[in-house]
């Protein structure tokens, strides 16, 4: 039975040209995360996270995505092309899988300034 | 005694092909993540492939990429690399090897198998 | 891809000396670092894992530490099955990558 649940930032915005974190966070369960995947809006992967491998960052995305802080992601550079869906998938045993969205909306500099509730500290 | 023996290396020319084998045993194959490393001659390690547990996924050096494919019959114990489009560079002798739970280390290869590419 | 450089490339050492072998890396690869030994004509063999954990069967006088990008394997008194390469390996970022080798040589 999967008792867990996922946390998100939710929705959330930034500016063109600077980061943001993706963050998901698994709770209510005991369950061995054995890899988190990392995916855009059109379900190419960004990055993977292997409890026995490491990270491995997609070739198309090594130049502005970091690993980290913890499962999260960095997306740095950012562009009006990324808005949209990002899905964290939690591989766990002996649970199975969970899934987290995240909605991230790229502002014009202006725009964002007055966004900043909508960023993570 | 867990044991890993490595197979199918040889002499070849380039643009050719080559499939290498990895046979186990002595520990429950299926349940560990496995690896190719190469060492060209006089030279230090390089990292070359991965296979999941069962199969499901792989990934490779940039190096290898497109000609090699890591793949694995865990029915016979026994690990598999395809080398295709083969260059000089890829001359070297082939380890596979199996990590320590949750240590990202590899700590049993095998003795290794020869691959030349020459014309 | 995470590059390791170890220093010194090759080192003359005596039996019973206390040789230190360094491994940095070009980011930070919090402790999944691993160190080898390599003698001529054999597979390497796991010494250290963790960064610092010794590998079972290993020898006490083995010991490494470091975290971040900064990392040593210290032997405390070097014996004569010692002499031999010695590499590190970073786990953090796939692909795993290897320093280039230290050789431990007899002086």
């Known amino acids: 039975m999967m008792t867990g649940t996922i946390e998100t930032t939710g929705n959330i915005s930034a500016k063109k040209g600077g980061s943001v974190i993706l963050q998901c966070h698994l709770s209510s369960t005991m369950a061995q995360v054995t890899q988190v995947n990392w995916e855009q809006h059109d379900h190419s992967l960004l990055a993977i996270r292997n409890a026995e491998l490491g990270w491995h960052i997609y070739p198309a995305f090594k130049d502005r995505v970091a690993p980290g802080p913890g499962l999260g992601l960095t997306l740095q550079s950012l562009t009006m092309n990324d808005t949209g869906e990002y899905f964290c998938t939690y591989h766990t045993y002996p649970d199975g899988t969970y899934r987290g969205r995240i909605f991230l909306e790229v502002l014009e500099s202006s725009v964002a300034e007055h966004s900043a509730r909508f960023q993570i500290p | 005694e867990v044991q890993l023996v490595e197979s199918g290396g040889g002499v070849v020319q380039p643009g050719r092909s080559l499939r290498l084998s990895c046979a186990a045993s002595g520990f429950t194959f299926g349940s560990y993540y496995m690896h190719w490393v190469r060492q060209a001659p006089g030279k230090g390690l390089e990292w070359v492939a991965v296979i999941w547990p069962d199969g499901s996924n792989k990934l490779y050096a940039d190096s290898v990429k497109g000609r090699f494919t890591i793949s694995r019959d865990n029915s016979k114990n026994t690990l598999y690399l395809q080398m295709n489009s083969l260059r000089a560079e890829d001359t070297a002798l082939y380890y596979c090897a199996k990590p320590v739970p949750k240590s990202r280390a590899l700590d049993v290869w095998g003795q290794g198998t020869m691959v030349t590419v020459s014309s | 891809d995470i590059q390791l450089t170890q220093s010194p490339s090759s080192v003359s050492a005596s039996v019973g000396d206390r040789v230190t072998i360094t491994c940095r890396a070009s980011?930070?690869?919090?402790?999944?670092l691993a160190w080898y030994q390599q003698k001529p004509g054999k597979a390497p063999k796991l010494l250290i894992y963790g960064a610092s954990s010794l590998q079972s069967g290993v020898p006490s006088r083995f010991s490494g530490s470091g975290s971040g990008t900064d990392f040593t394997l210290t032997i405390s008194s070097l014996q004569p099955e010692d002499f031999a390469t010695y590499y590190c390996?970073?786990?953090?970022?796939?692909?795993?990558?290897f320093g280039g080798g230290t050789k431990v040589e007899i002086k």
């Open positions: 390996q970073q786990a953090f970022y796939l692909p795993w990558t």
């Open positions: 980011q930070g690869i919090s402790s999944w």
